[in-house]
């Protein structure tokens, strides 16, 4: 059977600057040359779009300029990192990647990865 | 709230054409893939075509391909279903719906009737 | 293209019992994108269950859905009546999209 599975890492610990960086990667059940990414927030039972990025194999991967994600791509695995977050941004990311183009269409889900953020402590005044 | 109303069905002959439409309200259309899905009178549900985001990718049931265009104006929160040389066993009712976040049509239209007779 | 098979055909049942719906592939389903919808006489369908297993939002706890693979089963835990219904599974992880035939839930 053809099918398309995504695997991205269980837990990420986000940078104190708010960023958050991960793989995920894609075994492609057929030769794509068009790949949509999405990252989706699953927060109870609701799921929201983070951002997403398509691109032709072989080119990089292009988010809006307005977007909090930024990544690169490499064969069927891409990087991803998502900016600016803070703690109560701590969730499960989810890693959407659909084959579009040739035909026929492949949907594949990751499990997810769970992003832990901690707002960094404001720095004491200090005397000087 | 999140809604999808289509319209433009009706009764038409054999080899005319019809054109369907369904309008988006309450979510962010170009984020979302879209289906027409049929049923025949008294029948099951039947996949008819797909657009994807920003309208570019397409991809049709082999009973349509050829015959119908699926189509989508992001700027009107619109999708449409052009349908060219109808047969009699293409009428049904017609409904738009939503391919949601995780891949399920979430999201479903109450329905158009289309009927092809002479 | 994956062809989908629900058995039986019709059910007929008494409110209050158990049904229990059977939903076949012809190959295995990718990921287990297998949805269940409910549809009601001049109604459009409405998503009761989907991955399987995941309950869409807003539907009772009373619909479940199990199964992996080629085989998937949507369960009525006690029926209401309101559950009395046509139900069709579908396979959305590649295309072309297919729905089973669906399964008549009826009132015995």
């Known amino acids: 059977c053809k099918a398309m599975h995504v695997a991205q890492p269980a837990v990420v610990l986000a940078s104190s600057r708010g960023i958050a960086s991960f793989v995920c990667e894609y075994a492609s059940p057929g030769k794509a040359t068009e790949v949509r990414v999405t990252v989706l927030r699953q927060a109870d039972s609701q799921v929201t779009e983070v951002c997403a990025a398509t691109y032709m194999m072989g080119n990089e991967l292009t988010f809006l300029d307005d977007s909090i994600c930024t990544g690169t791509s490499s064969g069927n695995q891409v990087n991803l990192t998502i900016q600016g977050l803070r703690a109560m941004d701590t969730g499960l990311y989810i890693c959407k990647v659909e084959l579009m183009y040739p035909p026929p269409y492949y949907l594949g889900i990751g499990n997810g990865t769970q992003i832990y953020v901690i707002d960094p402590e404001p720095c004491p005044d200090s005397d000087f | 709230q999140v809604q999808l109303v289509e319209s433009g069905g009706g009764v038409v002959q054999p080899g005319r054409s019809l054109r369907l439409s369904c309008a988006a309200s309450?979510?962010?259309?170009?984020?979302?893939?879209m289906h027409w899905v049929r049923q025949a009178p008294g029948k099951g549900l039947e996949w008819v075509a797909v657009i994807w985001y920003d309208g570019r990718n397409k991809h049709y049931a082999d009973s349509v391909k050829g015959r119908f265009t699926i189509s989508r104006d992001n700027s009107k929160n619109t999708l449409y279903l052009q349908m060219n040389s109808l047969r009699a066993e293409d009428t049904a009712v017609y409904y738009c719906?939503?391919?949601?976040?995780?891949?399920?049509?979430?999201?479903w239209g109450q329905g158009t009737m289309v009927t092809v007779s002479s | 293209e994956i062809v989908l098979t629900q058995s039986p055909g019709t059910l007929s049942l008494s409110p209050g019992e158990r049904a229990t719906l059977s939903c076949r592939a012809s190959?295995?389903?990718?990921?287990?994108?297998l949805a269940w919808y409910q549809q009601k006489p001049g109604q459009a369908p409405r998503l009761l269950i989907y991955?399987?297993?995941s309950r869409a939002t807003g539907i009772p706890d009373r619909f479940s859905g199990s199964g992996s693979g080629t085989d998937f089963t949507l369960t009525i835990s006690r029926l209401e009546p309101e559950d009395f219904a046509v139900y069709y599974c579908?396979?959305?992880?590649?295309?072309?999209?297919?729905f089973g035939q669906g399964t008549k839930v009826e009132i015995k």
């Open positions: 190959q295995s389903v990718s990921s287990n994108f």
């Open positions: 309450g979510f962010i259309f170009s984020s979302y893939g």
């Open positions: 991955g399987a297993s």
């Open positions: 719906a939503r391919s949601g976040s995780l891949g399920a049509f979430d999201i």
């Open positions: 579908q396979q959305y992880g590649t295309s072309p999209w297919t």
